[in-house]
């Protein structure tokens, strides 16, 4: 039975050319996390593997950075980065937990950042 829950940064906005931290946190389960995937629609952004560590998808190697923690930092944002992002926790024995974040990249300098998410 899957008892865990994923908290995310939710809906966030950022300014074009800036950077943003995508953050998820899995709680309420003792399942072992074997890997965490970050995906944008069907495109792989990054993987954090429990044994091998971080892998940034080569297409994004110049503007995606691992962390903090199991989160992901997107840099040099463009309007095309607007959309849904998913953190996918692969765990044993529970299975897969998925969190969703919607990022809006704004042209204006009045981009309102969502509250900075803190891992408890």
């Amino acid at each position: 039975m899957m008892t865990g829950t994923i908290e995310t940064t939710g809906n966030i906005s950022a300014e074009k050319g800036g950077s943003i931290i995508l953050q998820c946190h899995l709680s309420s389960t003792t399942a072992q996390v074997t890997q965490v995937n970050w995906e944008q629609q069907d495109q792989l952004l990054a993987i954090c593997n429990a044994d091998l560590g971080w892998h940034i998808s080569p297409s994004f190697k110049d503007r995606v950075a691992p962390g903090p923690g199991l989160g992901l930092t997107l840099q040099s944002l463009t309007v095309n980065d607007t959309g849904e992002y998913f953190c996918i926790y692969h765990t044993y024995p529970d299975g897969t937990y998925t969190g969703r974040i919607f990022l809006e990249v704004l042209e204006s300098s009045v981009a309102e950042h969502g509250a900075r998410f803190q891992i408890p």
Partner: antibody, heavy 126, light 109 residues
Framework: QVQLQESGPGLVRPSGTLSLTCAVS?????????WSWVRQPPGKGLEWIGE???????NYNPSLKSRGTISVDKSKNQFSLKLTSITAADTAVYYC???????????????????WGQGTTVTVSS | SYELTQPPSVSVSPGQTARITCSGD??????AYWYQQKSGQAPVLVIH???KRPSGIPERFSGSSSGTMATLTISGAQVEDEADYYC???????????FGGGTKLTVLG
């Protein structure tokens, strides 16, 4: 400690079929790795032949023009290479290798070939 | 077919810095890997994903990538570093994987 050991005939006749096997110890052939074949003609550089994932997915060097087939035998914890229509140009040292990946489910996120066999020499001659 | 281009040879004196380059059109969006092959031995992975060093590889080995060029740097080359070095990557569609032609590093002892 993971070890790979190639085996097969040292001499193959032209137009024949080359069959090589790589025995895996210290790791399961069903684990999340690409199992690879690489060759090196005498005095030349390395050439990637192809690879197979535990799911059965395969990738091949297009230069082989469909002459190559890589397969896995889970019961024997080994994988194999078959190369048909052999010519003298296929004379080489053949290596098997394990390539680790970050995404254990799909094989995405290539880490690199971190364990290699010692190589086996194959000569094509009549 | 996709090609990775390396210089055939590089020579340094012991203690000097050796730099081996690898150029390929897809490298801005692909990773470079570097393998060391000493005479009569199987290759050894010394750098993966442009700049990561596997455990057991000396710190004098480092990698970098900029644009269409990847570089393997050996800071303070030692006689035992004399070997052939091959870069390795993928084409723009992800497969096939391909080796560069190899670079023979001579450490003039």
């Amino acid at each position: 400690q993971v070890q790979l050991q190639e085996s097969g005939p040292g001499l193959v006749r032209p137009s024949g079929t080359l069959s090589l096997t790589c025995a895996v110890s210290g790791d399961s052939i069903s684990s999340s790795n690409w199992w690879s074949w690489v060759r090196q003609p005498p005095g030349k550089g390395l050439e990637w032949i192809g690879e197979i994932y535990h799911s059965g997915n395969t990738n091949y060097n297009p230069s082989l023009k469909s002459r190559g087939t890589i397969s896995v035998d889970k019961s024997k914890n080994q994988f194999s290479l078959k190369l048909t229509s052999i010519t003298a140009a296929d004379t080489a040292v053949y290596y098997c290798a394990r390539a680790r990946v970050y995404d254990i489910l799909t094989g995405r996120g290539y880490y690199g070939m971190d364990v290699w066999g010692q190589g086996t020499t194959v000569t094509v001659s009549s | 077919s996709y090609e990775l281009t390396q210089p055939p040879s590089v020579s340094v004196s012991p203690g000097q810095t050796a730099r081996i380059t690898c150029s390929g059109d897809a490298l801005p969006k692909k990773y470079a890997y570097w393998y060391q092959q000493k005479s009569g031995q199987a290759p050894v992975l010394v750098i993966h994903e442009d700049r990561k060093r596997p455990s057991g590889i000396p710190e004098r080995f480092s990698g970098s990538s900029s644009g269409t060029m990847a570089t393997l740097t050996i800071s303070g080359a030692q006689v035992e570093d004399e070997a052939d070095y091959y870069c390795f990557s993928t084409d723009s569609s992800g497969n096939p994987r391909v080796f560069g032609g190899g670079t023979k590093l001579t450490v003039l002892g």
